[in-house]
């Protein structure tokens, strides 16, 4: 009924978790808009209450928590289902209070179906693995806290619809899977499912994450630029459209922004009174080296604009480059009536 | 607590056929495979094939192939086996058995099919 | 298919003994074997997935151990309601396929 820091809904965190499957869900209050944890605000007398909006429905609810064999249960800032049913969709609010303070945050949370191969509406994490570059791991993710320590579980690694056996360079080993040497045939989604008995009852935890194989580092060089160069040169008559593709490889490189840029006389294009326009195209290669073209254009060409500089700048984590075009000014062709006749001595 | 009640004993004449069923509690009847399998009199237990209810994709043994037909109701969270052109080598119990992967975890009480002329 | 052979069809032994029920596949599995009990009444029941992984609820007197080919039950302290036949199920490549399964009585 008082005021309360409703911080909305925190669409940032779109959790999505499979049917018949555990899910622990933390509080976003600690981990985003709170400057406190938990245990700090419990100990100060603060309590936290959940609470859910269903699927399609306006109207707030408490969270059930005596369901059958405690299915939905809270422990500390952890809201836990054991395991999900498909009608457990909505949006779930924790909301932290006492009599002189209130803060809370709504978060949508989505229970999806998968088929027989794991296929499901999942946003999938993607893991980048270098090409043919010794062993690399994945690990099954978001299982921690879900079982302790003293549990075993049992982890089946899939890849697509197979169980990951008997492969070449793909070993299973418990909650990792190594790569002995990633190949282009290695890309596809990922599958580990972590089975676990608890109170008399057993769980699966399935996640799937695609992996995409990229270019090595060892393999990565500067910025290459193939176009402009020496061998074209951009002769054109004042009145024509001027076109200068600037074309760049750049190899692969975790993070790195490679960047491809145009000057005209030492100065970027919108500072130069020149009625001038760039598009860009991006292309990629199987392992993700990037090939970017960028196209300068000037509709009516003056013989001023003939006689700029036009330099093509490229960027990356690897270094920078810069090459400049070689732009002239067509010689008119000679007219024959009199330029000729003329040279032939003609009277 | 999963929970997989099936049909009761069948007693059919050489050539005909039988729909057996498996009806599913307390877990996720679509996101789990039923398996199907066979136990002959005083003898072991054969895999005859399974179905993920969720898309109805099914996988057979070879030998069922043609002799077994496996379809789910998803909405009554029911398993079906069809045993077509039956004959005396028909004769036995059959069992479901879920399994959320490749392991039949939770398995049904088992149907007796008798072939008899 | 895989072929999974229970070289013993039947043994007796005697309450609170250990007993060790053995189990092999025609080629290598990868752990991918699966132990069940089917009770004098019919009832069949999962123990052990992937080759040691007690299943919920099963009483910790059960163990399976193995690996390639070469696989094992153990019931460290045999109890009366042990009693049952004991099946081995590989589950590395469709179709799945059980061994020919153990009798266990008490002697």
């Known amino acids: 009924s008082e005021r309360c820091d409703d911080w909305g809904l925190d669409t940032m965190r779109q959790i999505q978790v499979f049917e018949d499957e555990p899910a622990r869900i933390k509080c976003p209050l600690f981990e985003h808009f709170l400057k406190f944890n938990y245990s700090t605000a419990h100990s100060a007398g603060l309590t936290l209450i959940w609470y859910w909006t269903r699927q399609d429905r306006d109207l707030e609810e408490p969270i059930n928590f005596r369901l059958p064999e405690n299915r939905i249960s809270k422990e500390k800032d952890v809201l836990w289902f054991r395991p999900t049913l498909l009608n457990d969709t909505g949006n779930y609010t924790c909301m932290l209070r006492n009599t002189t303070y209130c803060s809370k945050v709504a978060f949508p949370l989505e229970v999806v179906q998968k088929d027989s191969c794991f296929n499901s509406p999942m946003k999938l994490p993607v893991h980048k693995l270098y090409i043919e570059y010794g062993i690399q791991r994945i690990t099954c993710p978001n299982v921690d806290g879900y079982f302790p320590s003293s549990v075993k579980p049992t982890i089946t690694w899939y890849m697509g619809c197979y169980k990951i056996q008997n492969f070449n360079n793909v070993i299973p080993e418990g909650m990792n899977l190594s790569f002995l040497i990633a190949f282009i045939s290695n890309n596809g989604n990922y599958t580990c499912v972590v089975t676990y008995p608890e109170n008399g009852r057993t769980f699966h935890l399935t996640r799937t994450l695609t992996v995409k194989v990229v270019g090595s580092p060892k393999n990565a060089v500067p910025p290459v630029i193939h176009s402009p160069n020496d061998h074209v040169v951009y002769e054109k008559e004042p009145g024509e459209e001027l076109l200068i593709p600037c074309t760049v490889y750049f190899s692969f490189l975790m993070d790195s922004r490679n960047e491809v840029w145009w000057t005209i006389d030492g100065k970027k294009p919108d500072d130069i009174p020149i009625d001038v326009t760039i598009n860009e195209s991006i292309s990629h290669s199987r392992t993700e080296d990037e090939t970017r073209t960028q196209i300068l254009s000037i509709k009516k060409v003056t013989s001023e604009d003939l006689k700029r500089s036009y330099v093509c700048h490229a960027r990356s984590a690897k270094g920078e480059v810069a090459k400049a075009a070689t732009v002239k000014q067509k010689v008119p062709a000679p007219r024959y009536t009199v330029e000729l006749a003329c040279g032939f001595g003609a009277t | 607590q999963v929970q997989l009640q099936q049909s009761g004993p069948e007693l059919l004449k050489p050539g005909a056929s039988v729909k057996i069923s498996c009806k599913a509690s307390?877990?996720?009847?679509?996101?789990?495979?039923m398996n199907w399998v066979k136990q002959r009199p005083g003898k072991g237990l054969e895999w005859i094939g399974r179905?993920?209810?969720?898309?109805?994709?099914?996988h057979y043994s070879g030998k069922f192939k043609g002799k077994a037909t496996l379809t789910a109701d998803k909405s009554s969270s029911i398993a079906y086996m069809q045993l077509s052109s039956l004959t005396s080598e028909d004769s036995a119990v059959y069992f479901c058995?879920?399994?959320?992967?490749?392991?039949?975890?939770?398995w049904g009480q088992g149907t007796s099919v008798t072939v008899s002329s | 298919d895989i072929q999974m052979t229970q070289t013993t069809s039947s043994l007796s032994a005697s309450l609170g003994d250990r007993v060790t029920i053995s189990c092999s596949a025609s080629?290598?599995?990868?752990?991918?074997l699966n132990w069940y009990q089917q009770k004098p009444d019919g009832t069949v029941k999962l123990l052990i997935h992937?080759?040691?992984g007690l299943h919920a609820g099963v009483p910790s007197r059960f163990s399976g151990s193995g690996s390639g080919t070469d696989y094992s039950l153990t019931i460290s302290n045999l109890e009366p309601e042990d009693v049952a036949t004991y099946y081995c199920?590989?589950?590395?490549?469709?179709?799945?396929?059980f061994g020919g399964g153990t009798k266990l009585e008490i002697k």
């Open positions: 992937y080759t040691s």
């Open positions: 307390g877990y996720a009847f679509s996101s789990s495979w």
């Open positions: 058995g879920e399994g959320y992967l490749d392991p039949m975890d939770y």
């Open positions: 179905i993920y209810p969720g898309d109805g994709n099914t």
């Open positions: 080629q290598g599995i990868n752990n991918y």
């Open positions: 199920q590989q589950y590395s490549i469709l179709p799945w396929t």
